[in-house]
Amino acid sequence: FKVATPYSLYVCPEGQNVTLTCRLLGPVDKGHDVTFYKTWYRSSRGEVQTCSERRPIRNLTFQDLHLHHGGHQAANTSHDLAQRHGLESASDHHGNFSITMRNLTLLDSGLYCCLVVEIRHHHSEHRVHGAMELQVQTGKDAPSNCVVYPSSSQDSENITAA
């Protein structure tokens, strides 16, 4: 499978909410022995590999924000901890995987990465990730609502080992 990032850039005004999205593409194994570990974290555009560095989102680590579920299930974070920080990650039946950030501030600007690990416990792991930029703006130049910029097809279907 691959991870697509439908949008590579989100430009939002301060105080707005935004939902960053990744999408699983291609065949997804729905066997009973297959589970998916999905999470989000902040990173920086490394010279060697984007998303190699894992930094917290609003002080929450990728482990705090992770989901795990079977291949055919939906899931979302019900952690009070995440919601207290204005965050919620979710995954649906159609391969969409998102994180919602509420009440954005300038400090939320940066590179965000989604990570998906397909796990056949004791057998195999397949990891892919996607990256997108969030720019939070303030003042007269800020948009009134979030503006999203589609990824090029090359970017959005790029498979990268995490």
Partner: antibody, heavy 112, light 111 residues
């Protein structure tokens, strides 16, 4: 069944390789883990090689141990043993949920 | 690092009584991959329970596992002399790299 071998008395810093030999099943179909137990102490997970060949180690074990696999054996190399590595070393088969089959263990003593 | 805390470290039980052992993980165990092992001196560990509550083949139904997330329990009912041993919990974690961890063990002494 599983049988560990290679345990012996070694001096600190002398590399040592332990071998786990399987009989009655194919190693290529299973994950294989290594666990150790110091005298009078509890079980301590060292690492595992899963079916695809990926190898994972406990954070404390990285650099100290190397796991490798052939068609008939799984090896654990202790790169530079210290007295703290004195223990019985077990290999165990990963059965998809946990470790369902264990060897009897082999004793490694590190002493100068 | 993952820490698995087992309590109590030692427990005394009368024949026919009940023993409860608790295992608490510092992070949520992945997909309920939590097992319990019994070990007697000079022997390798023996699997009792896997997936938190599934009894391993050939194991007495007097052993019962329960729990989810970070907290798990092993209950031994109708304790017998042969149950005298050390019991360990073992959990699997993906963070996101694979890690297994063992609890510190609980010694069960049967009176």
């Amino acid at each position: 069944s599983l049988e560990e071998s290679g345990g012996r008395l070694v001096t600190p810093g002398t590399p040592l390789t332990l071998t786990c030999t399987a009989s009655g099943f194919s190693l290529s179909s299973y994950a294989m883990g290594w666990v150790r137990q110091a005298p009078g102490k509890g079980l301590e997970w060292i690492g595992i090689i899963i079916v695809s060949g990926n190898i994972y180690y406990a954070s404390w074990a990285k650099g100290q141990f190397t796991i490798s696999k052939t068609s008939t054996t799984v090896d654990l190399k202790i790169t530079s043993p210290t007295t703290e590595d004195t223990a019985t070393y077990f290999c165990a088969r990963g059965d998809g949920y946990t470790y369902g089959l264990w060897g009897q263990g082999t004793l490694v003593t590190v002493s100068s | 690092d993952i820490v698995m805390t087992q309590t109590p470290a030692s427990v005394e039980a009368a024949v026919g009584g009940t023993v409860t052992i608790k295992c608490q993980a510092s992070q949520s165990v992945y997909s309920r991959y939590l097992a319990w092992f019994q070990q007697k001196p000079g022997q390798p560990p023996k699997l009792l329970i896997y997936s938190a509550s599934t009894l391993a083949s050939g194991v007495s139904s007097r052993f019962k596992g329960s729990g989810s997330g970070t907290e798990y329990t092993l209950t031994i009912s109708g304790v017998q002399c042969d149950d005298a041993a050390t019991y360990y919990c073992q959990g699997t974690f993906y963070i996101p790299d694979y890690i297994d961890g063992f609890g510190g063990g609980t010694e069960v002494v049967v009176k």
